[in-house]
Amino acid sequence: KNLKSPQKVEVDIIDDNFILRWNRSDESVGNVTFSFDYQKTGMDNWIKLSGCQNITSTKCNFSSLKLNVYEEIKLRIRAEKENTSSWYEVDSFTPFRKAQIGPPEVHLEAEDKAIVIHISPGTKDSVMWALDGLSFTYSLVIWKNSSGVEERIENIYSRHKIYKLSPETTYCLKVKAALLTSWKIGVYSPVHCIKTTVENELPPPENIEVSVQNQNYVLKWDYTYANMTFQVQWLHAFLKRNPGNHLYKWKQIPDCENVKTTQCVFPQNVFQKGIYLLRVQASDGNNTSFWSEEIKFDTEIQAFLLPPVFNIRSLSDSFHIYIGAPKQSGNTPVIQDYPLIYEIIFWENTSNAERKIIEKKTDVTVPNLKPLTVYCVKARAHTMDEKLNKSSVFSDAVCEKTKPGNTSK
């Protein structure tokens, strides 16, 4: 009896794992084995596919074959008993195009109100993704084990920290990888669960802000208790993208080590141009807090976002304010590459009641003022880009007296 060729051959590639599956064409025939050949583009001869010769099952693995994953290949299969079936040719394919991204490895660390997630590609030193290792982004789904309400977090890198969680609570999550450059979305990892710890005695510092004063950066934060010491660390932001490396060498800012105030000042030249992460930790000598939320700090944006400089022309019932480019040391104006919004605060010198004007223009009228009254004005700049969302510090206050009642010009 003639053997029939196997049918319905499927090629599954996940990371560097190449799996073939097929259907027996004739279930009634026993002791049949199957063998594959492959052919590279531009070659006439067929080569035996190692790992897929004389297979008794309907599945084989040819991961050991060292293929150029960007090169098209063709496969063929036949059944063998005493005689052989005709060859059945599988549509040619390019491994890289066909490949799926496998589930990533996930490593979790617990704090009282945060979880640190370290993500690594599922296959270490993968051949398939060798050129794309740094292009992986990840997304995750997280939920409280008790509620099951899911939250999705997109576009994260190989280290991500989730804040504002509840202490002593079990959270579960799953992660998948994506290669957006190749329109590939991966397979979810298994579900990983971790319980946050009991609440720490000392909370982490909050509301960290960086501003520029003269040639220095000023880092400020809020803290609940007095008589604490603080330390500040920085890390190059790009290191969070580094796949497989989970040793993050956070560095001390020398002028911000063991400071006793909720701010520290350090020279701008501590940082070269770039994007950094900053974090702050508190200690009372016996206990240490967990690290604060990490803030992104872009020297380019921070450097340009100096407080605005302005002139006031005083009338009887209003001020005309003309906003100019801020001056750096040496009295040279700073070129603003970003569209800015200006926040102007003014108040009567004898009162604490502040009023606010938000304006995109650089000439602003402050209306409804009383004649012959001293008003003070301060201003700051904000970036209009939501992603950057930076603000300068306020300028020094400038105080001027309005003109007598009869002058309106």
Epitope: A110, T197, L247, Q252, N286, T288
Partner: antibody, heavy 118, light 107 residues
Framework: EVQLQQSGAELVKPGASVKLSCTAS????????MHWVKQRTEQGLEWIGR????????KYAPKFQGKATMTADTSSNTAYLQLGSLTSEDAAVYYC???????????WGQGTSVTVSS | DIVMTQSQKFMSTSVGDRVSVTCKAS??????VAWYQQKSGQSPKALIY???YRYSGVPDRFTGSGSGTDFTLTISNLQSEDLADYLC?????????FGGGTKLEIK
Amino acid sequence: EVQLQQSGAELVKPGASVKLSCTASGFNIKDYYMHWVKQRTEQGLEWIGRIDPDDGETKYAPKFQGKATMTADTSSNTAYLQLGSLTSEDAAVYYCARGGNYYVMDNWGQGTSVTVSS
Amino acid sequence: DIVMTQSQKFMSTSVGDRVSVTCKASQNVGTNVAWYQQKSGQSPKALIYTASYRYSGVPDRFTGSGSGTDFTLTISNLQSEDLADYLCQQYFSYPHTFGGGTKLEIK
């Protein structure tokens, strides 16, 4: 294969100083932290400190500040521990260890025994 | 400094036993705890990191658990080659500190 080869046993006089070495193979020390740990006979482990060989940044346990000095030479892939003004309290086995992923000491040298005797 | 306390200096055990070695931190250290095994005359060997992750090559009879201040290393079906000193270590903050160790002995 990752290996840390430490220098041989030292017999030193009280008041003298000694420099121990730890040569790494199978990895580049500048990509890791290098730790030093002390163990006195029949006692537990004491963390001395760690160095980032990439830039020389060090952290010491307060107890060893002024006693120990850690350095590293990335060209020879070697970390060093210098101990000064030695007393009988400093007699111990000193281990170097690699600080790897998640900050853990994942590989250890075989240890160097330091004896202080006049 | 954070103090890591291993209250049992010695534990009498038998081959096949399930043994739990405990370690208590003087403050919340999250999951920043590692466990090491040290056999007589040898260097320490890392077994567990981040409180519960096993190093590759470490038999799955070794399990780490705990977070915050209380940590446990459990050895199920104890083998004769497991007789050693077991030390916990915190790396939450400097200086990193070790527990005093727990020595497993045969009854």
